[in-house]
């Protein structure tokens, strides 16, 4: 291909790619009609004056994963058509003022994963058409007022993974078109009232993994278009009653990994579009009535790994669309017979790792679509007659690690389990805990007459003798008491995810591998 440097590959579509450690300077001559140039994984350490002077038609320029630490102010002269510029994954500590001057068409500027220590208003003052600015993964400690004032068309700004300790309430005030703002993994301890007031079109706000202790009551009151709000892994101990009041479009809210002790009444709402609420790893001790009653479209509610010991019978009022409810690893001993009454569409419930001693016979009475029930590692000695009678879709039931009492009263349960064995999974079966002479024996195959002699047992067990149909849809059985799962949760729609090491037999929210992805 005419005019293609030997260390590069050039395609007929005007795309040039130059890679390799032997490249120490921008290759020349570059094809005059190049529209896309990628310089990747080279040993280039600096960009001198006008290395791209003869390729003025360039639209996209990626100079990534190099040793680049110094750029001359005029390095990008004559690139008036450039729309996309990435300098990500280099070793830049400073940006010369005027570096982006003349890049009148620039829409995306990626400066992520460098070592930038500061940015100044003059850096971006010429970039009036910029739509995307990526600054994550640098060493920024503060953002000066005015830094983004000229970027009125900006729709996406990523400042994650820096060292920001505070944010001025004026720094985003002119970004009325901003749709995505990411401030995750910084050192923010509080966010001043008014900081987000100008962001009337904001759809995603990522504040996870900071050190935020308090949220101002009106912090999000102007963000009526907000759809995703990530507040996980902070130090939030209480939520002001009105903090989420003006968020009618919100569909995902993550609050896991904070220090919430209680959920203020009416805190969630009205949020008619909220689909997912992540509250695991807090210090919540009880759930009062109606705490989620504004969340009519909620499908996923994760309350695991708290200290919940009491759930009021009306706590889940209004959650008629809920599909997944995770309550595992709490301190539950009792459940009122009406507590799940409203959850008509529930498919999966995880109650493992609690202290439940018994379950009400009608606990699942209205929850006809249940497919998975996790009850392992509780204090259950028996279950009421017919508790699973109506659950025709049940394909996963975990009952192991409970102190089952294998006397004559266990027979109906044993008989039902015999007929529904595949639902229990193959890895761990429930075993008897008492009487002592049958301890450790499988509940399913135990001869109850050995355990307790001559007790009258009804001939027809009250548990449904529903046959197990092999074609019933089933989740893959991936539970293992000793497994260690590397977990990403929840799945946010970008790659900067919080990974947590857990030694749970499932995952943080207690669902199957199929669900946890």
């Amino acid at each position: 291909y005419h005019g293609c440097p030997s260390e590069c590959t050039c395609s007929r579509a005007s795309q040039v790619e130059c890679t390799g450690a032997r490249i120490v300077a921008v290759p020349t001559p570059l094809p005059w009609n190049a529209m896309s140039l990628q310089i990747l994984n080279t040993h280039i350490t600096e960009l001198n004056e006008s290395p791209f002077l003869n390729i003025s038609a360039l639209i996209a320029l990626r100079i990534e994963k190099n040793e680049l630490s110094r750029i001359t102010p005029g390095a990008f002269r004559n690139l008036g058509s450039l729309r996309y510029l990435s300098l990500a994954n280099n070793k830049l500590q400073v940006l010369p003022i005027g570096l982006f001057q003349g890049l009148d068409s620039l829409e995306s500027l990626l400066l992520s994963s460098n070592q930038l220590l500061q940015i100044q208003p003059a850096h971006f003052s010429q970039c009036s058409n910029l739509k995307e600015l990526q600054l994550h993964g640098n060493h920024l400690e503060y953002i000066p007022d005015g830094a983004f004032d000229h970027l009125v068309g900006l729709t996406k700004l990523n400042l994650g993974k820096n060292s920001l300790t505070h944010i001025s309430p004026r720094v985003f005030q002119h970004l009325g078109n901003l749709q995505v703002l990411r401030l995750y993994e910084n050192r923010l301890t509080d966010i001043p009232m008014g900081t987000f007031d100008g962001l009337v079109n904001l759809q995603e706000l990522a504040l996870q993994q900071n050190q935020i202790g308090l949220l101002s009551p009106g912090l999000f009151h102007n963000n009526h278009n907000l759809q995703r709000l990530y507040l996980s892994n902070n130090h939030i101990s209480q939520l002001p009653p009105s903090v989420f009041m003006q968020l009618p479009q919100l569909n995902r809210l993550t609050l896991f990994g904070n220090s919430l002790k209680e959920l203020s009444p009416g805190i969630f709402g009205p949020m008619p579009n909220l689909r997912e609420l992540w509250l695991y790893d807090n210090h919540i001790s009880s759930l009062p009535d109606n705490v989620f009653s504004n969340l009519r479209q909620l499908q996923v509610l994760i309350l695991s790994r708290n200290q919940i010991s009491f759930i009021s019978p009306g706590a889940f009022n209004g959650l008629t669309e809920l599909r997944e409810l995770s309550l595992h690893t709490n301190a539950l001993q009792d459940l009122d017979g009406n507590v799940f009454r409203m959850l008509a569409n529930l498919q999966n419930i995880s109650l493992q790792n609690n202290r439940l001693r018994q379950l009400p016979g009608n606990i699942f009475a209205n929850v006809n679509g249940l497919m998975a029930i996790q009850l392992q590692n509780n204090q259950l000695e028996n279950l009421p007659l017919g508790i699973f009678d109506h659950l025709g879709k049940l394909c996963e039931l975990r009952l192991y690690d409970n102190p089952w009492r294998c006397d004559s009263d266990i027979l109906p349960l044993r008989n039902w389990l015999l007929l529904n064995q595949p639902r229990l999974g193959t890895d761990t079966v429930p075993v008897c805990f008492s009487p002592a002479n049958v301890r450790g024996q499988s509940l399913i195959i135990i001869n109850v007459n050995v355990a307790v002699p001559s007790v009258h047992v009804p001939e027809v067990p009250s548990y449904p003798e529903t046959p197990w149909y092999p074609d019933t849809p089933s989740y893959p059985d991936t539970t293992s008491v000793s497994s260690t799962t590397e977990l990403t949760s929840p799945v946010e729609d970008y790659t900067d995810l919080t990974t947590i090491q857990v030694t749970d037999d499932r995952s943080v929210w207690g669902m199957t591998q199929a669900q946890s992805g």
């Epitope: 209680e262 009535d289 009653s293 019978p313 009792d334 009122d336 017979g337 009454r341």
Partner: antibody, heavy 118, light 107 residues
Framework: QVQLVQSGAEVKKPGASVKVSCKAS????????INWVRQAPGQGLEWMGW????????KYNEKFKGRVTMTRDTSTSTVYMELSSLRSEDTAVYYC???????????WGQGTLVTVSS | DIQMTQSPSSLSASVGDRVTITCKAS??????VAWYQQKPGKAPKLLIY???YRSSGVPSRFSGSGSGTDFTLTISSLQPEDFATYYC?????????FGGGTKVEIK
């Protein structure tokens, strides 16, 4: 239908204890919390605590902690509320009450008058 | 503890009158408020739960409203059988607490 039937009136001396019973019927006794609420003559209502009959777990109003004990007998579907170290201000009608679909009192016993008098 | 302040403590009204009783919580209780009717020598009877939902069998002349800290019970057209004492109750946090009561008497 749900019914809560309480024991009869009691007269006690200060310092004594009283044990009031509440027999439940019309539903599965072990599956629902039962509360105790009292009402002094001409006064308002005061929540004393709850018991979960399935496990015997209890939660008491701090005001009565150390003096009140709630127990249950699953074989007779009966809960008991015992109040000790009685004083004249404990003179009241004591009600057992069961929650409905929320933590409000849908079903009430008929009440038991406890009079504390020397 | 959350205080429930009910007003008035008593009122006189005639059959057919519209009666309004208010209850103010000392802190936010969301919609976790119930209203009860009690007649002399009888146990209280649930009228309204979750601030505005009528209990089954309760006549439609009884209605409740409010959220947060301010709640109202309204009897749109007082009937002879409505002369009684009315109590509000919060069940958002322990200990559950009641208002002092409002006695509705015949004028």
């Amino acid at each position: 239908q749900v019914q809560l039937v309480q024991s009869g009136a009691e007269v006690k001396k200060p310092g004594a204890s009283v044990k009031v019973s509440c027999k439940a019927s019309g539903y599965t006794f072990t599956d629902y919390y039962i509360n105790w609420v009292r009402q002094a003559p001409g006064q308002g209502l005061e929540w004393m605590g709850w018991i979960y009959p399935g496990s015997g777990n209890t939660k008491y109003n701090e005001k009565f902690k150390g003096r009140v004990t709630m127990t249950r007998d699953t074989s007779t579907s009966t809960v008991y509320m015992e109040l000790s170290s009685l004083r004249s201000e404990d003179t009241a009608v004591y009600y057992c009450a069961r929650w409905g679909y929320g933590a409000y009192f849908t079903y009430w016993g008929q009440g038991t008058l406890v009079t504390v008098s020397s | 503890d959350i205080q429930m302040t009910q007003s008035p403590s008593s009122l006189s009204a005639s059959v057919g009158d519209r009666v309004t009783i208010t209850c103010k919580a000392s802190q936010n209780v969301g919609i976790n408020v119930a209203w009860y009717q009690q007649k002399p020598g009888k146990a209280p009877k649930l009228l309204i739960y979750s601030a505005s939902y009528r209990s089954s069998g309760v006549p439609s002349r009884f209605s409740g409203s409010g959220s947060g800290t301010d709640f109202t019970l309204t009897i749109s057209s007082l009937q002879p059988e409505d002369f009684a004492t009315y109590y509000c109750q919060q069940y958002n946090s322990f200990p559950y607490t009641f208002g002092g009561g409002t006695k509705v008497e015949i004028k």
